[in-house]
């Protein structure tokens, strides 16, 4: 069942990096400066995307089958204790809001994540299983094409991806509680 799949996924990066409890306080001096959107809404130009109606089961399946492996590959060579989880999420839509923000919003110290394989797969799964999400990405895609094709993995990017692993883990946990 779902629990077995989840347990099988608990390799190093899923177990480490801040433990099972998440701080709900503000981001204290981490590399990524973004706002928390606990409502599950993503700012997209002049409007917000609401992740409430996504097919969470399908997204979870895509994550467990392939996205998680790409995230872990990206983190290879680092230890799960190297970074602390400073970003949290409280429910499934909120988790997707934070995942979207950390994956696709460039920051001064980590601007290249959107070109990574895990990011492309994350974009695809959101576009497929979140009604109307693809429409919000049409203009965003033009901007991304103009972005630099930098492939340098900085320590700050590793820290950001460790936060992503924590958010995805939390997303899975909120799903498991619903089973």
């Amino acid at each position: 069942g779902l629990n077995d799949i989840f347990e099988a996924q608990k390799i190093e990066w899923h177990e480490g990096g801040g433990g099972s409890d998440y701080k709900d306080d503000d981001d204290k001096g981490s590399s990524h400066h973004h706002h928390h959107h606990s409502s599950g809404l993503v700012p997209r130009g002049s409007h917000m995307y609401d992740f409430t109606n996504c097919d969470f089961q399908k997204i979870e399946a895509d994550y467990l089958r392939t996205i998680s492996k790409d995230l872990i590959t990206y983190m290879s060579g680092t230890k799960s204790t190297d970074f602390n989880n400073t970003v949290s999420c409280s429910n499934r839509p909120h988790c997707l809001t934070e995942i979207q923000s950390l994956t696709f919003n460039p920051t001064p110290r980590c601007a290249s994540l959107a070109k990574e394989m895990f990011a492309r797969k994350t974009k695809a799964t959101l576009a497929l299983w979140c009604p109307g999400y693809s429409e919000t990405q049409i203009n965003a895609t033009q901007a991304m094409k103009k972005a630099r094709k930098s492939k340098v993995t900085t320590n700050k990017c590793l820290e950001q991806v460790s936060q992503l692993l924590g958010l995805w883990r939390r997303f899975i946990r909120t799903l498991l509680k619903k089973q």
Epitope: T66, P131, T141
Partner: antibody
Framework: QVQLVQSGPEVKKPGSSVKVSCKAS????????MHWVRQRPGQDLEWMGT????????DYNQNFKGRATITADKSTSTAYMELSSLRSEDTAVYYC?????????????WGQGTLVTVSS | EIVLTQSPGTLSLSPGERATLSCRAS??????VHWYQQKPGEAPRLLIY???QSISGIPDRFSGSGSGTDFTLTISRLESEDFAVYYC?????????FGRGTKVEIK
């Protein structure tokens, strides 16, 4: 340029299966989902399902669930649609169509269609 | 599933005239509607995506508008090659669905 080339026409008996292929070229295969759409004689278009190579996953129209299987061979950039337990109402032209999954998000290129005739 | 209702079923017009085709969705689908043209014996061809986005290579006499539940495809001045069947399609959510088509025929 982008091309989707489908396999040739098929004549099948009721109760049998058919497997239609769609060979893609001119683009990165994994950047696009492959959808299958059918059109019965004189009828409108009906979405059957899709395979997403990037995520190794598929999704189906409930009307075809259990009878349709959509797969892909990434090494040859070829998608397949197999329909089992054929009946006369399955006589139709079957189209493959690509759709971007990280950009464009629309069926912007179509195969030429494969006519499948189900007759005893 | 989302049902798309196209009207009229048939539109009889002369070359040079303006054609207005309608597509109504059974629920709110934002702007996730695409328009295709199909001629006998051919595969559908994409004309407009996400309600109003134009496609390179498609003549600019084709334009789209609408959002929510009501969408329109307009052909400003019909050319002889425009007489065909036009379908709207939604990609808002699975299962993807098509309208039943509007046939634009020569009067």
């Amino acid at each position: 340029q982008v091309q989707l080339v489908q396999s040739g026409p098929e004549v099948k008996k009721p109760g049998s299966s058919v497997k239609v292929s769609c060979k893609a070229s001119g683009y990165i295969f994994t950047d696009y989902a492959m959808h299958w759409v059918r059109q019965r004689p004189g009828q409108d278009l009906e979405w059957m399902g899709t395979f997403i190579p990037l995520l190794d996953t598929s999704d189906y129209n409930q009307n075809f669930k259990g009878r349709a299987t959509i797969t892909a061979d990434k090494s040859t950039s070829t998608a397949y649609m197999e329909l089992s337990s054929l009946r006369s109402e399955d006589t139709a032209v079957y189209y493959c169509a690509r759709m971007g999954v990280t950009h464009s998000y629309v069926m912007d290129a179509w195969g030429q269609g494969t006519l499948v005739t189900v007759s005893s | 599933e989302i049902v798309l209702t196209q009207s009229p079923g048939t539109l009889s017009l002369s070359p040079g005239e303006r054609a207005t085709l309608s597509c109504r969705a059974s629920q709110h689908i934002s702007r996730s509607v695409h328009w295709y043209q199909q001629k006998p014996g051919e595969a559908p061809r994409l004309l407009i995506y996400f309600a109003s986005q134009s496609i390179s290579g498609i003549p600019d006499r084709f334009s789209g508008s609408g959002s929510g539940t009501d969408f329109t495809l307009t052909i400003s001045r019909l050319e002889s090659e425009d007489f065909a069947v036009y379908y709207c399609q939604q990609s808002y959510s699975f299962p993807y669905t098509f309208g039943r088509g509007t046939k634009v025929e020569i009067k």
